[in-house]
C-alpha cells in the first residue's frame, strides 16, 4: 500500500526528508503589494526535503516511480515533495469599490507527500 | 493567474520541461510478478522534466513557490513535475479463489503539472 514502511522514518536524518516548513514572505516578495493590502507578511507553509525510496508515497504511482527510479535513475526521476493538502487563507485586497476579503484555497500547504 | 504566460512554452528547449513520458516496465521491474498475472508488461506514463518559472503551474501555491525559489533558492525548492491526473488501469491478479480483475486509479499518469 502507499503507506508501507518506511513511509515515515527518514533514512537521511532529521529534517532531511519531505516535510512542511514555514517560509516568511512579504507582499513585495510575492509581487502582490499592488492588490493585496493585508496581511503585509504571510507565513507560508511549503513542502521541502527529499523523497527517499517509499518515504511518504502519495499513491501507487509514486511507489512505482520510486522503484523505477532505483532501476533507471537517468530515465525516471525520484518522487518529489509536494503539497498533499492546503490551508485556506483569507486576504484583504483592493477592489474598485474599496477593500474586500477573499479566500484562497491553494496558497498555503497543510501537508506534504512524495509524488 | 496560474495560467499566465509562459505557462506552456518551454524556455529550456523541446522536451526539457515538465511533460508526460512513456516508460516500459515489466512486472519483475515493479516487483509484482508474484501477484499480478497480466499484462506482463506495462506502459507507464510518468511525469518528467524541469519546471522553469511559472511553467505549467499547478495552482497559486506553485506560483508562489516558483517566485520564492527565485528569491531564496537555497531555502525554497523549485516546483517539480508531478501528475495532475491519472488514467485507470485494469490488472488481472491472483486471489485465493483463482484470478480476478481489479482497477487501479492512481497508477498511470494522464497529465502533468508543476507543483
Amino acid at each position: 500500500s502507499a503507506h508501507a514502511h518506511p513511509r515515515d522514518s527518514c533514512p537521511l536524518g532529521p529534517g532531511r526528508c519531505c516535510h512542511l516548513e514555514t517560509v516568511q514572505a512579504t507582499l513585495e516578495d510575492l509581487g502582490w503589494s499592488d492588490w493585496v493590502l493585508s496581511p503585509r507578511q504571510l507565513q507560508l507553509s511549503m513542502c521541502v526535503g527529499e523523497c527517499p525510496h517509499l518515504y511518504r508515497s502519495a499513491n501507487t504511482h509514486a511507489q512505482i516511480k520510486a522503484r523505477l527510479h532505483g532501476l533507471q535513475p537517468d530515465k525516471v526521476p525520484a518522487p518529489c515533495c509536494v503539497p498533499s493538502s492546503y490551508t485556506p487563507v483569507v486576504l484583504m485586497h483592493r477592489t474598485d469599490s474599496g477593500v474586500s476579503l477573499q479566500t484562497y484555497d491553494d496558497l498555503v500547504a497543510r501537508g506534504c507527500h512524495c509524488a | 493567474s496560474a495560467h499566465a504566460h509562459p505557462r506552456d512554452s518551454c524556455p529550456l528547449g523541446p522536451g526539457r520541461c515538465c511533460h508526460l513520458e512513456t516508460v516500459q516496465a515489466t512486472l519483475e521491474d515493479l516487483g509484482w510478478s508474484d501477484w499480478v498475472l497480466s499484462p506482463r508488461q506495462l506502459q507507464l506514463s510518468m511525469c518528467v522534466g524541469e519546471c522553469p518559472h511559472l511553467y505549467r503551474s499547478a495552482n497559486t501555491h506553485a506560483q508562489i513557490k516558483a517566485r520564492l525559489h527565485g528569491l531564496q533558492p537555497d531555502k525554497v525548492p523549485a516546483p517539480c513535475c508531478v501528475p495532475s491526473s491519472y488514467t485507470p488501469v485494469v490488472l488481472m491478479h491472483r486471489t485465493d479463489s483463482g484470478v480476478s480483475l481489479q482497477t487501479y486509479d492512481d497508477l498511470v499518469a494522464r497529465g502533468c503539472h508543476c507543483a
Partner: antibody, heavy 119, light 110 residues
Framework: EVQLVQSGAEVKKPGESLKISCKGS????????IGWVRQMPGKGLEWMGV????????IYSPSFQGQVTISADKSISTAYLQWSSLKASDTAMYYC????????????WGQGTLVTVSS | QSVLTQPPSVSGAPGQRVTISCSGS????????VNWYQQLPGTAPKLLIY???NRPSGVPDRFSGSKSGTSASLAITGLQAEDEADYYC??????????FGGGTKLTVLG
Amino acid sequence: EVQLVQSGAEVKKPGESLKISCKGSGYSFTSYWIGWVRQMPGKGLEWMGVIDPGGSYTIYSPSFQGQVTISADKSISTAYLQWSSLKASDTAMYYCARYGRYGTYFDYWGQGTLVTVSS
Amino acid sequence: QSVLTQPPSVSGAPGQRVTISCSGSSSNIGVLYVNWYQQLPGTAPKLLIYSNDNRPSGVPDRFSGSKSGTSASLAITGLQAEDEADYYCQSWDSSSNYVFGGGTKLTVLG
C-alpha cells in the same frame, strides 16, 4: 499570554453616541486582525466586521455597513467599535476577537462589553 | 436566519457521545474550513475546533470535528456536566464573509 480586554458595560439613551474599546496584549497587535461580533440577548453570534490594525483597513458585514465604525490605535494596541446614534435594537453584548494566522477563525476573544440602550 | 444551520438543542447523559451538526452550502462550508466555538453560560465564546478537525492546545480530545461536503459536525464523547454550553459553528461565505450557525444548546441530563 494573549489577552483582549474590553471596556466596561454601558447604559445609553437612543440617539446617543458610544465608543467601546478592546485592548490587545501578549502579542504583536499589528500582526493580527481584530473582528467584532454581536450577540443580542438570548440570540446567536453575528460577525460585524474586521480591522487590520497595522494598516487600519476595515471591512464590514453587509448587515452592519453604515451602522457602526471600526477603528484602531496601534500606538496603544487598541481597537474600537463606535456608534454615532444608538437605537434600542443595538442592545447586545459585543465581543472583540483576534483572528488566527490565516484569517479564517477567531483564536482569542475579549470578555465582552454589554451595551444597553433604553429611554 | 443563519447561513449555517444547527439544531437548536441536543442532550445526552454523562459519559455518552453526542454530535452537533452544521449544514451549509457550496459557497461556505463546501469551500472553506469549519470552526467550532463553545460558549459557557455567562462567558465569552472560546475556540474549540479550527480548520475542521484541529484542537487548540488545552481543548480535551473528547472534542472532535469533521467535515463532509457542505456539512460539518462536532462530536463530544464521554459527556461531562461542564460541557453544558452553547456551541456555534463558523465558516466563511463568499457573500457575507464570516458566518456563524444559529447555535446549539447542549444539555447534560441527570
